[in-house]
Amino acid sequence: QRFAQAQQQLPLESLGWDVAELQLNHTGPQQDPRLYWQGGPALGRSFLHGPELDKGQLRIHRDGIYMVHIQVTLAICSSTTASRHHPTTLAVGICSPASRSISLLRLSFHQGCTIASQRLTPLARGDTLCTNLTGTLLPSRNTDETFFGVQWVRP
Amino acid sequence: QRFAQAQQQLPLESLGWDVAELQLNHTGPQQDPRLYWQGGPALGRSFLHGPELDKGQLRIHRDGIYMVHIQVTLAICSSTTASRHHPTTLAVGICSPASRSISLLRLSFHQGCTIASQRLTPLARGDTLCTNLTGTLLPSRNTDETFFGVQWVRP
Amino acid sequence: QRFAQAQQQLPLESLGWDVAELQLNHTGPQQDPRLYWQGGPALGRSFLHGPELDKGQLRIHRDGIYMVHIQVTLAICSSTTASRHHPTTLAVGICSPASRSISLLRLSFHQGCTIASQRLTPLARGDTLCTNLTGTLLPSRNTDETFFGVQWVRP
């Protein structure tokens, strides 16, 4: 009971409010399928409270189960474009440390120009998340069309 | 430490459990692209705990970062219908106060009949969220096909 | 105030951290449209903390408002396949107890090969959630393409 009481008296931050919502900064150079993200109040409605950006990739600072969500809209896209350039695929995964590398979330565009999904997944301090967009189409940089975020849910 | 202890002794409600899940009430009159929402246990599985409805639009009562989510399915829709009536677009945004007006989330239907997405965004007490459906197709009123909600995540 | 203080001194688990993320185990026998799920660290990144599996269906252990989310990708699928086999529909609902049976979330694939959505809904202890996939196409078992989860949000 003592422990529980002490635990409750920690600042709420210590209960784990880690959260981030990012906007697209740019795509990678040729042969690099990764999307590069940015965040911060100066940029609009994106933010990082806990997680950090490491060369445009999201690095986790607190162990726990996270809700990961993403929406990517292709620029200058119609269903004709999307099907002509098929396959265009988005994958979100842990890309470092290499020992923990895994794909968490994968979607193809088929005849659509937007994908959006979310999932719960355990993440550990130091995990870096990468979002790989494969294909020849480019993502929209509009902040209401393309975004990526995580929310700490429980230990 | 005193402050943290006092803070922990507030009812849990004060930690910010604001949440709402709404079902479609009706579309707007001509030239008004907004969807009008309703919520409450008498209507089924929709509810408002904290946020309120103001003429069918959702008004926020507590500052914080929110997870906003939406699904809209078009009535009497097939991929042929959707492409024939293209563009049909859904946008979720802050529509008042005017000084904070911004689009938060935008999706087009292309050859699909349902859009679904979610994002994290800072909202302030008094922000009213509007959901604009542009195009000639109409949203389904089935409660498992069309819904809109917010969940307070952190201060 | 006494009650609030005592309440705060309960272990955090008692605040309701119930959460589950499941991966597809198998589809049902003919005439059974249900998807059968599995979860646990031995299987990869799926887990159950609170809810339980009952013959592959998810059973809730704590009353509250939950965020329910799902992604299902069809195996060996292209937009041509999807439209040729239309309608293929996914519905998530409470399937038992029978008195609470209701559809919570419904999406059709149309010309796409993946559906993904989420919603907030009240669930009660003992509610069992079923995910029905109707049509002739089969879901992918890849853990980054097909998954289903719930997260307790508030009482």
Epitope: - | L24, N25, H26, T27, P29, Q30, A75, T136, L138, R141 | -
Partner: nanobody, 113 residues
Framework: QVQLQESGGGLVQAGGSLRLSCAAS????????MAWHRQAPGKQRELVAI???????NVDDSVEGRFTISRDNAKNMVYLQMNSLKPEDTAVYYC???????WGQGTQVTVSS
């Protein structure tokens, strides 16, 4: 109490046509999205056609090219024009204020082969 009243149903041979009408008191039709549903024996009620306030209508794929929905806001009326009728179109047809639980009594349409 607002009433919706359908008319125009009947018995028709396959390939024939019918025009269903829906009338209401007040301005209920003029001010709302309207729909036609149908229910065949032993089947669930299904949405067949829908029309927005501005007059843009949409019909289900199963009746595309054969049925059209229209409205006359001045007369507070909504119509369903049904051409090239098939036996599988046999059902009770209901007029509905789509976003409200407001229904007519229905009109029987029987298509004989």
């Amino acid at each position: 109490q607002v009433q919706l009243q359908e008319s125009g149903g009947g018995l028709v041979q396959a390939g024939g046509s019918l025009r269903l009408s829906c009338a209401a008191s007040g301005s209920i039709i003029r001010d709302n999205v309207m729909a036609w549903h149908r229910q065949a024996p032993g089947k669930q009620r299904e949405l067949v056609a829908i029309i927005n306030i501005g007059g843009s209508g949409n019909v289900d794929d199963s009746v595309e090219g054969r049925f059209t929905i229209s409205r006359d806001n001045a007369k507070n009326m909504v119509y369903l024009q049904m051409n090239s009728l098939k036996p599988e179109d046999t059902a009770v047809y209901y007029c509905n204020v789509y976003y409200r639980d407001l229904w007519g009594q229905g009109t029987q349409v029987t298509v004989s082969s």
